[in-house]
């Protein structure tokens, strides 16, 4: 009953003459233990006898005997662990067929058949490839041999085009009830160059002898492999030459589908064949060329060919580091003239005239000066010829106004109060002068550019300077105007005495002035309209009060005369010319009022008066007027007065007062 038995084994075992077989086998019986195990070769069931007949290779009996001549068969199993593994070593071709495993338990019987396939010669392994091989994509190559036996050592070796492959292969074996095999796995990154190449897996015995092999041809899918050829084979060509570039497809799997050409990475229009012809090349065709070819795997780009189109220098142009340039600055000139090969020699021109000794691309002027201005041009030369000289570049050299001078336009001499016209001149300037500056600054009129009009010129306008200005101001040396004017600052100054003037003093007055142009002057002294002298000093040996008064001095030069302010000369003197006056006359009737006044001439005025009688007796009066009221006859007599100021005293002569009796008094008498 098959349901009672469960036997596991590979089903078919492969081997070859002289090798061995190892048959992994396990069993399970549902009812009881295995009692008898017989290994048949090609068993056949005899219906009549109800038993299996055939060559017995092994029989497990009580003593476990093996039939004679079958020492090569070994039962490796045991009843304890349900193992029915067996081996035949060596194995022969005539062992091919069925191995019958007759198993008997107490109650059940079973015949298990295992196919044994023993070939005359070792059979080849099988190479297994993935469905698609693509360049540079790693894959695993498998070499599988449905054989493995503990008693027979084998080796699998990989070869590419007959040469052992360097990559390390991983070999594994399986001796299980599921499968028996030896397998070698190789990790491999196919390159385009492997396409069409033969990979071999060789089966070797323990001595390294090749027993069998399997071969496959690699079908490596890859982008087109390209090389580029140039004819003529020189990539340096001259302008006007023709050049052909050929894109060679050395390999492509699958076949290429499209072709294009690129210059400096940019596709060329309508160029889709493997040949690119450039007729009469121009300098613009200089560049890096490559072809791009695509197949189903992808596009491929060839290496770049650098095509250099040589040409004579093109018309030049001059680049100037700065224009306008400021005088004294550094200026660099650069000759720009595209050429291939680069120019080896340059010729420079200034205003059309060749500049000696300058043969390089750059021409430098360390300190630019006005005469360096003009047009600069250049010629460049290479092996193909001399380039055309371009129109040139203009250098403008800017500088402050030069040689600035001032001119007085007036007829000389200039007098104070005149209108003076000055002009500011210069020899050259770049850019043009656009304004002028004047020193000192004044509210003066500039009737036109560079002309200054000073109206009513002051005596003290001594020097004037002008500047002519463009981007910079250049100053002229100041011009002295030499303004002529009448003496100024005329005044009277007392030289002596140092203190106040007293009558009798020696007195000196000085006529001073602050300035005069011209310097030559004359002096005049005047008192109350009368001319006193013509010296700078006015002297009094002994001053008298009559000399007091208002004095002026005049100073004149050829331009005019100037008077000082009137100066008051004050003479101090003691009271003098004292006299007593009586308003009512010197005869007065008794009972009336007699008024005596002390009159005096004094400087400063009298501040104190004293009165005396004929006996020189001081009277008790201190005022200027002596008032007797009512006057008596006894008052008759002579009187005098004395006046005092801070200079001194003075007294009057006697004056007689006569007091007569009134008619009443006479009448009483």
């Amino acid at each position: 009953d098959s349901s009672k038995w469960n036997i596991e084994h590979p089903g078919t075992i492969y081997a070859w003459e002289g090798a061995c077989v190892w048959v992994p086998c396990t069993y399970r019986v549902l009812d009881g233990a295995l009692e008898t195990f017989i290994l048949f070769h090609n068993p056949e069931y005899n219906q009549n006898m109800s038993k299996f007949e055939g060559t017995r290779l092994y029989e497990s009996t009580k003593d476990g005997k093996v039939p004679s001549g079958q020492k090569r068969v070994q039962f490796l199993g045991n009843k304890i662990n349900n193992n029915c593994t067996l081996s035949i070593h060596p194995v022969h071709v005539n062992d091919s067929g069925q191995l019958g495993l007759r198993m008997v338990s107490k109650t059940e019987k079973w015949m298990e058949r295992i196919h044994l396939n023993v070939s005359e010669r070792p059979f080849p392994p099988r190479i297994q490839l993935p469905p698609k091989l693509q360049e540079s994509q790693e894959v695993t190559l498998t070499c599988l041999l449905n054989f493995s036996c503990y008693g027979y050592q084998i080796q699998l070796q990989w070869l590419l085009e007959g040469v052992p492959m360097r990559q390390a292969a991983v070999t594994s074996t399986s001796l299980s009830t599921k499968s028996v095999f030896t397998r070698s796995e190789l990790k491999f990154s196919p390159q385009w160059s492997h396409h069409g190449k033969i990979v071999t897996c060789e089966l070797h015995d323990v001595d390294g002898k090749v027993l069998s092999e399997d071969m496959v041809q690699l079908n490596v899918k890859h982008t087109p492999k390209l090389t580029i050829e140039v004819t003529p084979n020189e990539t340096i060509v001259r302008k006007g030459d023709s050049v052909t570039m050929t894109c060679k497809v050395n390999s492509s799997n699958p076949e290429y589908t499209t072709v294009s050409w690129l210059k400096d990475g940019i596709p060329l229009k309508e160029q889709n064949t493997l040949m690119l012809t450039l007729h009469e090349v121009t300098k613009s065709q200089t560049g890096r060329y490559c072809c791009r070819v695509s197949n189903d795997v992808g596009p491929a780009t060839s290496e770049k060919v650098f095509l250099q189109v040589q040409y004579a220098p093109e018309p030049s142009r001059v680049q100037i580091s700065q224009s306008p340039a400021v005088e004294g600055s550094e200026v660099n000139f650069l000759c720009i003239s595209p050429a291939n090969p680069l120019p080896t020699n340059y010729t420079w021109y200034h205003n059309g005239k060749e500049v000696q000794g300058r043969t390089e691309k750059q021409f430098q002027i360390q300190k630019i000066l006005p005469w360096h201005a003009g047009t600069y041009s250049c010629e460049a030369e290479n092996i193909l010829g001399i380039g055309e000289r371009g129109p040139g570049t203009e250098l403008d050299v800017q500088y402050p106004p030069k040689k600035v001078t001032m001119v007085i336009e007036n007829p000389t001499p200039i007098r104070e109060g005149d209108t003076v016209t000055l002009s500011c001149n210069y020899s050259s300037s770049n850019p043009i002068v656009n304004h002028y500056e004047w020193r000192p600054r004044g509210a003066w009129e500039e009737p036109s550019l560079g002309v200054l009009k000073i109206q009513n010129i002051g005596w003290n306008n001594t020097a004037v300077a002008c500047a002519a200005c463009n981007n910079w101001c250049s100053w002229a040396s100041p011009v002295t105007l030499n303004v002529l004017y009448a003496p100024r600052g005329v005044r009277v100054r007392k030289i002596k005495p140092l203190s106040e003037i007293h009558s009798g003093n020696s007195v000196s007055l000085q006529c001073d002035f602050s300035s005069s142009h011209p310097k030559e002057v004359q002096f005049f002294w005047e008192k109350n309209g009368s001319l006193l002298g013509k010296e700078s000093q006015l002297n009094f040996d002994s001053i008298s009060p009559e000399d007091a008064g208002s004095y002026s001095c005049w100073v004149n030069n050829s331009i005019g005369q100037t008077a000082s302010k009137a100066w008051t000369l004050e003479v101090l003197y003691a009271p003098r010319r004292l006299r007593v006056s009586m308003s009512q006359g010197n005869q007065v009737m008794e009972g009336k009022t007699a008024t005596l006044t002390c009159e005096s001439d004094a400087n400063p005025p009298v501040y104190s008066y004293a009165w005396f009688d004929w006996n020189n007796q001081s009277l008790p009066y201190s005022g200027r007027m002596l008032r007797l009221e009512p006057v008596k006859v006894q008052h008759s007599g002579a009187y005098w007065c004395q006046g005092t100021n801070r200079v001194g005293k003075g007294h009057s002569p006697l004056i007689t007062l006569t007091v007569y009796y009134s008619p009443q008094t006479i009448g009483r008498r």
């Epitope: 004294g328 500049v355 000794g357 002027i365 360390q366 630019i368 000066l369 005469w371």
Partner: antibody, heavy 122, light 107 residues
Framework: QVQLQQSGAEQVKPGASVKMSCKAS????????IEWMKQNHGESLDWIGN????????EYNEKFKGKATLTVEKSSNTVFLELSRLTSDDSAVYYC???????????????WGTGTTVTVSS | DIVMTQSQKFMSTTVGDRVSITCKAG??????VAWYQQKPGQSPKLLIY???TRYIGVPERFTGSGSGTDFTLTITNMQSEDLADYFC?????????FGTGTKLELK
């Protein structure tokens, strides 16, 4: 034609100073700098310095700073070289040379003066 | 300062000879080299500038060559009036410097 006429030979005592002249003619004086060279007894030449008559700009070889002073007198188209604190090492022929129209300090010299011989001896 | 070395102080020659006077610069001076001729009692005269350009009026037998540090003045078909001192000068760097000179003498 372009000429640079130099003053005559000088015999001077150590410690003294000497001032030699170089008068230009045959070209616009203010458009070219004037360079000065020293030559010892027919041997190598030494560049002393230069002056530009246009703006009195001077430039000296470090070696001659403090020894040489260059001045110009535009009215007479003349450049002067004054050497001070003279020693026997200053005995040489001194040449004035016309410099570059484009004012380059890097130049070669096509117009040379007649030379002034200076002898320093006590 | 750039040193200009004229290793031969004196050179003996005969009329008709080809003479090469050398000058070595202490550092690269490109082609900024001039050659001068000086006869006894005279001022130097410019022969060559820019290493190889002949100055106006200079006979064709005088040629200059070289660049960088090595320069040569060649006189083909030497004449008796060529007996003189020859100086090289660099004008590539400041200050300008001259060679020590080479004197041509008759053998």
């Amino acid at each position: 034609q372009v000429q640079l006429q130099q003053s005559g030979a000088e015999q001077v005592k150590p410690g003294a100073s000497v001032k030699m002249s170089c008068k230009a003619s045959g070209y616009t004086f203010t458009t070219y700098p004037i360079e000065w060279m020293k030559q010892n007894h027919g041997e190598s030449l030494d560049w002393i310095g230069n002056i530009h008559p246009y703006n009195d700009d001077t430039e000296y070889n470090e070696k001659f700073k403090g020894k040489a002073t260059l001045t110009v007198e535009k009215s007479s188209n003349t450049v002067f070289l004054e050497l001070s604190r003279l020693t026997s090492d200053d005995s040489a022929v001194y040449y004035c040379v016309r410099g570059d129209y484009y004012n380059s300090r890097y130049w070669y010299f096509d117009v040379w003066g007649t030379g002034t011989t200076v002898t320093v001896s006590s | 300062d750039i040193v200009m070395t004229q290793s031969q102080k004196f050179m003996s020659t005969t009329v008709g000879d080809r003479v090469s006077i050398t000058c070595k610069a202490g550092q690269n001076v490109r082609t900024a080299v001039a050659w001068y001729q000086q006869k006894p009692g005279q001022s130097p005269k410019l022969l060559i500038y820019s290493a190889s350009t002949r100055y106006i009026g200079v006979p064709e037998r005088f040629t200059g060559s070289g660049s960088g540090t090595d320069f040569t003045l060649t006189i083909t078909n030497m004449q008796s009036e060529d007996l003189a001192d020859y100086f090289c000068q660099q004008y590539s760097s400041f200050p300008l410097t001259f060679g020590t000179g080479t004197k041509l003498e008759l053998k």
